[in-house]
């Protein structure tokens, strides 16, 4: 097989019971109703056909019911993220039922075997939901399945098998191996619930992608492009590696989806927003910061249901830790050059000055290449709320700061010895805030002084001729 993982067990080989359950007395799938935020507290175990625990543990039939579904495990015990998620759900939805689906005996196996067990676990959850539906006042519409990694596909199977339609499934970095390109009924898909939202935090185009790359929900959110998560770089986890756990690097990015979801529960006042875009590169260019026609949404728990959309890819940048929210800005910069600047790409930085705060010196990331005598779009983001933008400073990093630029400068000189100087003319910069959707145009103070060269800076202020400002009220007022 040309794919890293071979196929799961054949259809005709599939048993009514997975191998691991044959000799066990303890059921291989248990439903633990968490009655306390305290992870040490045992909670109540629910089982189909036994109504007493529902009464004993005050299961609220009219409230929301969350099912948390873990994924493949190497340790065989619950990881810390699960307790944090339980606690966050209890904090946010005080009356809700929070049920932990414990399928550790079936998940603590070879990955391929754990994958083979996802169907039977999904079926067990569906049977539990079918039984609960027989009770007065219980509604499938109030059920929210939250699955992490392999657990996301378990949630998909549960939604698939249940009689009726589950209200919502959230996939937290659904597993990639053996699910990438799988049939619609063999993985999490938009058909599995009334609303399926997905966070992808560990996708890789090259090498093994721990998380699934393809969109599998109504909305699929790719924080930081869905791959390299801030705070999860080698440098950030070197301490972990020193203690012999290189898996911490993988875990950090894969588990980031859970922490983003927890963040959305506990930091309601700092909601993160994602923007619809066809791909990560276009987002990095700053092209996709529109909120028109439902093109933006809250991420995590606060995501707004968009059933008309299917497999809608959305992107955002985040901080390295909680709260993850950042403020996105689109910069449209028209760059004009009277002389040919050759292949050299200017290394530009912008500093934004606002009514609340000022930004750091932010690099203008060149995704492909800067087009001269054209409008270039950039994405920048800040960790703090700057308030209303007042002015901005554009700097062109001096040649000496960059070996790459130094080499390009030398090469340019060799090819064009008569005209080695580089100069760009930038008269105005149009800025759009992703979070408020406000647009402001900034102009150079002196229209005659709009040129910039390496090592120089250029200041921009709000244009005198009536700077543009649209959508004065934030579209997110009703989303938060």
């Amino acid at each position: 097989s040309p794919v890293p993982f071979g196929p799961e067990g054949r259809l005709e080989d599939k048993l009514h019971k997975p191998k691991a359950t044959q000799t066990e007395v303890k059921p291989s799938v248990r439903f633990n109703l968490r009655t306390s935020k305290d992870p040490e507290h045992e909670g109540c175990y629910l089982s189909v056909g036994h109504s007493q625990p529902l009464e004993d543990c005050s299961f609220n039939m009219t409230a929301k019911t969350f099912f948390i579904i873990h994924g493949w495990t190497m340790s065989g015990i619950f990881e810390n993220w699960l307790h944090k998620l339980v606690s966050a759900l209890h904090t946010r939805e005080k009356d809700a039922n929070v049920v932990v689906v414990d399928w550790l005996p079936l998940a603590h196996q070879l990955y391929t075997d754990a994958v083979n067990n996802t169907r039977v676990v999904g079926h067990s959850i569906a049977r539990m939901l079918d039984w609960l539906q027989e009770k007065d006042d219980f509604s499938l519409g109030n059920v929210h399945l939250i699955g992490y990694s392999l657990g996301a596909h378990v949630a998909g199977y549960a939604g698939n098998f249940v009689k009726g339609t589950v209200g919502r499934i959230t996939g937290l970095d659904p597993a990639g191996p053996m699910f990438e390109g799988a049939d619609i009924h063999k993985r999490l898909s938009p058909d599995d619930a009334d609303f399926v939202d997905v966070l992808h935090t560990y996708t890789r185009s090259f090498g093994l992608s721990i998380g699934i790359q393809m969109p599998v929900g109504h909305i699929d959110i790719y924080p930081n492009g869905g791959d390299f998560q801030p705070g999860c770089g080698l440098n950030d986890v070197l301490g972990s590696i020193a203690y012999g756990t290189i898996t911490e690097v993988v875990k950090c990015e894969h588990e980031r989806a859970v922490h983003l979801f927890v963040d959305s529960l506990v930091n309601q006042d700092k909601p993160s927003f994602a923007f619809q875009c066809t791909d990560s590169n276009r987002f990095k260019k700053g092209i996709c910061l529109s909120c028109r026609k439902n093109r933006c949404n809250n991420i995590g728990y606060n995501a707004k249901k968009m059933r008309k959309k299917r497999n809608s890819k959305m992107y955002l940048k985040t901080r390295a830790g909680m709260p993850f929210k950042v403020y996105h800005y689109q910069l449209k910069v028209h760059m004009f050059s009277y002389n040919n600047s050759g292949d050299t790409q200017p290394t530009l930085y912008i500093t934004l000055y606002g009514s609340n705060a000022d930004s750091q010196n932010l690099p203008l990331e060149i995704v492909e290449k800067i087009e001269l005598n054209a409008t270039n779009t950039f994405l920048v983001y800040t960790e703090e709320d700057l308030g209303d933008l007042l002015k901005m400073r554009l700097t062109w990093e001096g040649v000496a700061h960059s070996w790459y630029n130094l080499w390009n400068e030398f090469r340019n000189y060799l090819s064009q010895p008569s005209n080695p100087s580089r100069e760009l003319y930038i008269r105005r910069i149009r800025v759009k805030s992703g979070e408020t959707q406000r647009k402001v145009t900034f102009c150079t103070q002196d229209p005659t002084k709009s040129s910039i060269s390496p090592g120089q800076e250029l200041w921009f202020h709000k244009c005198q001729d009536g700077w543009k400002m649209k959508n004065k009220t934030s579209p997110f007022v009703n989303l938060a």
């Epitope: 097989s1 599939k14 990438e180 938009p190």
Partner: antibody
């Protein structure tokens, strides 16, 4: 092993209805989707829709909504497709197929001929 | 609906040759594509799923590749028994859609 046994050929009058059966053996019938596929002579394959027997959930191709109706009987491990208001356009071979990786296993097909 | 297009309705080849059949999707279907073989008078058979996985019991002369919108099905050394119509199908979203089929003829 997995087998899908379909009912025999049918010769029907225009305007009539026909019900085709597909009996499954060799796997857990209730938890795998069964699809129905149409193939007209000299034409390609056309997905009509599918049913999950355990929950009676169905998915239909818009083109066949109102034309095809799926049901399933889990006690006999049999899936059914009823075609109504038959016209000559409905003359075709109809296949049932069980879905896992793709349409893994197919029935032998049921020929339906609509003629006055 | 996603349209799957097989540009060649017929392809002619000789025993022992290598032949490739292409299929194009009208939108991104990632790697969610299956290939089926239908021999004259028989039901279709699944050969390849998820673009490149061989189904149980399928000889290794049959391979699949591609991602996104362009997919290729290859028979590395054509045998006489490979005379059939080959169909691609996307299994990324409902409604599932098939390509028009490519009839492989043996010279």
């Amino acid at each position: 092993q997995v087998q899908l046994q379909q009912s025999g050929a049918e010769l029907m009058k225009p305007g009539a209805s026909v019900k085709i059966s597909c009996k499954a053996t060799g796997y857990t019938f209730s938890t795998y989707w069964i699809a129905w596929v149409k193939q007209r002579p000299g034409h390609g394959l056309e997905w009509i829709g599918e049913i999950l027997p355990g929950s009676a959930k169905t998915k239909y191709n818009k083109k066949f909504k109102g034309k095809a109706t799926f049901t399933a009987d889990t006690s006999s491990n049999t899936a059914y497709m009823q075609l109504s208001s038959l016209t000559s356009e409905d003359s075709a071979v109809y296949y049932c197929a069980v879905y896992d990786y793709g349409a893994d296993y197919w029935g032998q097909g049921t020929s339906v001929t609509v003629s006055s | 609906d996603i349209v799957m297009t097989q540009s060649h309705k017929f392809m002619s080849t000789s025993v022992g040759d290598r032949v490739s059949i292409t299929c194009k999707a009208s939108q991104d279907v990632y790697t969610a594509v299956a290939w089926y073989q239908q021999k004259p008078g028989q039901s279709p058979k699944l050969l390849i799923y998820s673009a490149s996985y061989r189904f149980t019991g399928v000889p290794d002369r049959f391979t699949g590749s591609g991602a996104g919108t362009e997919f290729t099905f290859t028979i590395n050394s054509v045998q006489a028994e490979d005379l059939a119509v080959y169909y691609c199908q996307q299994h990324y979203s409902i409604p599932r859609t098939f390509g028009g089929g490519t009839k492989l003829e043996i010279k």
